[in-house]
């Protein structure tokens, strides 16, 4: 058997660090057997069999000029093997961050904090942490570790499915190369990393007869669980075209009637979502949708609310169907004082 331990990486390659002493090992001889060493393609003897170093070649303070292929020969001139030297650095702790788009799963991504120049792989696992004692704030790793399954095709990402919203997890991402391993531990709780995807299917419609009104509606993001234990709350922003500043409201549900739109101007509208108990952070904004308040004449009779909100003849396509859910929308109020003022303003 070879006297050379096989480092992780391709066969026949041995590794060292620039500026450090490097030992190369002749793979096809018995440990301690004296050998001669040559650079591949060069006749000059690098180290003879009388060096006292047996089957090893020592390169003091290796640098990039030492990289390449070496040949070792036994005393009788037989080929002891070829070795390729590659220089690089031990791993540094990777940089890890985790995010969750819902309250049941989370993913972690990583990047090397330093490039080692060597073949590198990552080991990913997690533990669930539990509180020690009823009154204690101390936490200790208790269950696991379990593997955090990595995305195929080498994407630097792993996903934990079926996580518990109220638990804390310790993520372990270990960078491994032939010169060693280095581990980053990251404590995460779903509550703090939760960031929903933005709401989908945003549409903006005019309200016939009301030149300062727009009705915006949207659906939950498709990534939010279909039968949610946790609801989302929303934030809506709107602004007339060419106006730099957004107005912000927090709707009670999946629609909002804007009552102070600028008559005749198209308006941009966007929405964002967050866990209804304020866990985590707000989602990114949805793509903007545009709508222009109605310029039509006011009906002689004030219609009932339901008639104001007739559905368009052709239903706009939505990215994905919204899950059925309890409505958080209060019953729309009948026309209030603001409506009267608006009517007067239009009639004047």
């Amino acid at each position: 058997s070879s006297p050379c331990p096989q480092a992780w990486g391709p066969p026949g390659v041995q590794y060292g660090q620039p500026g450090r002493s490097v030992k190369l090992c002749c793979p096809g001889v018995t440990a301690g057997d004296p050998v001669s060493w040559f650079r591949d393609g060069e006749p000059k003897l690098l180290q003879g069999p009388d060096s006292g170093l047996g089957h090893e070649l020592v390169l003091a303070q290796a640098d990039s000029t030492d990289e390449g292929t070496y040949i070792c020969q036994t005393l009788d001139g037989a080929l002891g093997g070829t070795v390729t030297l590659q220089l690089g650095y031990p791993p540094a702790r990777p940089v890890v961050s985790c995010q969750a788009a819902d309250y049941e799963n989370f993913s972690c991504t990583w990047s090397p904090s330093q490039i080692s120049g060597l073949p590198t792989r990552y080991l990913t696992s997690y533990r669930k942490k539990t509180v020690l004692g009823a009154d204690s704030q101390r936490r200790s790793p208790s269950t696991g570790p379990w593997p955090c399954p990595q995305d195929p095709l080498g994407a630097a990402r792993c996903v934990v499915h079926g996580a518990e919203f109220w638990s804390q997890y310790r993520i372990n991402v270990t960078e491994v190369n032939p010169l060693g391993a280095s581990t980053r531990l990251l404590d995460v709780s779903l509550q703090s990393i939760l960031r929903p995807d933005p709401p989908q299917g945003l549409r903006v419609e005019s309200v016939p007869g009301y030149p300062r009104r727009l009705r915006a509606s949207w659906t939950y993001p498709a990534s939010w669980p279909c039968q949610p234990h946790f609801l989302l709350k929303f934030r809506l922003q709107y602004r007339p075209a060419q106006h730099p500043a957004w107005s912000t409201v927090e709707p009670a549900g999946l629609e909002e009637v804007i009552t102070d739109a600028v008559a005749g101007l198209p308006h941009a509208v966007r929405v964002s979502a967050r866990d209804f108990l304020d866990a985590g952070t707000w989602s990114t904004w949805s793509p903007e949708a545009w709508g222009t308040p109605s310029t039509g004449t006011i009906p002689k009779e004030i219609p009932a609310w339901g008639q104001l909100h007739t559905q368009p003849e052709v239903e706009p396509q939505v990215d994905s169907p919204a899950p059925p859910r309890p409505s958080l929308q209060p019953h729309p109020r009948l026309l209030d004082h603001r409506d009267s003022v608006e009517q007067v303003a239009v009639l004047a």
Partner: antibody, heavy 118, light 107 residues
Framework: EVQLLESGGGLVQPGGSLRLSCAAS????????MTWVRQAPGKGLEWVSS????????QYADSVKGRFTISRDNSKNTLYLQMNSLRAEDTAVYYC???????????WGRGTLVTVSS | DIQMTQSPSSLSASVGDRVTITCQAS??????LNWYQQKPGKAPKLLIY???NLQTGVPSRFSGSGSGTDFTFTISSLQPEDIATYYC?????????FGPGTKVDIK
């Protein structure tokens, strides 16, 4: 020679913007994370932001989150810090630093002074 | 964020004296602690990394020890050129933090 050289500092009004640059030489810039650290006049050191070699992960101090953006151009061996919505408390000498293992700063630039004042 | 405290905030000692500075972290940072020296108008310089390792080229009179939350930095024999402010800094997590510094001068 291994060195870092910051530029882009100066006087700016509150609410204004500034872009700092850090030119690296003498080492393989694209292999290392890079960092900005600042020091207000007469005060201690404060880590501001860091970025991994690929640029794919960035990290910010809470005091600058949402206002500052760190970036890098590995083809130009240059690190950047885009500073928006500047405040008086951002007045400091800004140092560019090369860390080993993300947080061990073994190489520093000489710094560039940013003054935010009306 | 992990908070770092240093003591004393300043000290005066005679040339040849042994000088000790302590640094405490608000939570366990293993041995991910560095010590820097900063002279007026200059950039900081790394002296000790990972609690106890001497950075290349740094005189051996500087040393560090400790792990967990409590760390110590020592100058075994203070020299005139050691007049500076010394900072500890943790990098256990992804948001490094510095101690407030200890100003050292000569009596």
């Amino acid at each position: 020679e291994v060195q870092l050289l910051e530029s882009g500092g100066g006087l700016v009004q509150p609410g204004g913007s500034l872009r700092l640059s850090c030119a690296a030489s003498g080492f393989t810039f694209s292999w290392y994370s890079m960092t900005w650290v600042r020091q207000a006049p007469g005060k201690g050191l404060e880590w501001v932001s860091s970025i991994v070699p690929s640029g794919g992960h960035t990290q910010y101090a809470d005091s600058v989150k949402g206002r500052f953006t760190i970036s890098r151009d590995n083809s130009k061996n240059t690190l950047y810090l885009q500073m928006n919505s500047l405040r008086a408390e951002d007045t400091a000498v800004y140092y560019c630093a090369k860390p080993e293992d993300w947080g061990r700063f073994d190489l520093w630039g000489r710094g560039t002074l940013v003054t935010v004042s009306s | 964020d992990i908070q770092m405290t240093q003591s004393p905030s300043s000290l005066s000692a005679s040339v040849g004296d042994r000088v000790t500075i302590t640094c405490q972290a608000s939570q366990d940072i293993n041995n991910y602690l560095n010590w820097y020296q900063q002279k007026p108008g200059k950039a900081p310089k790394l002296l000790i990394y990972d609690a106890s390792n001497l950075q290349t080229g740094v005189p051996s009179r500087f040393s560090g020890s400790g792990s967990g939350t409590d760390f110590t930095f020592t100058i075994s024999s203070l020299q005139p050129e050691d007049i500076a402010t010394y900072y500890c800094q943790q990098y256990d997590n992804l948001s490094p933090t510095f101690g407030p510094g200890t100003k050292v001068d000569i009596k």
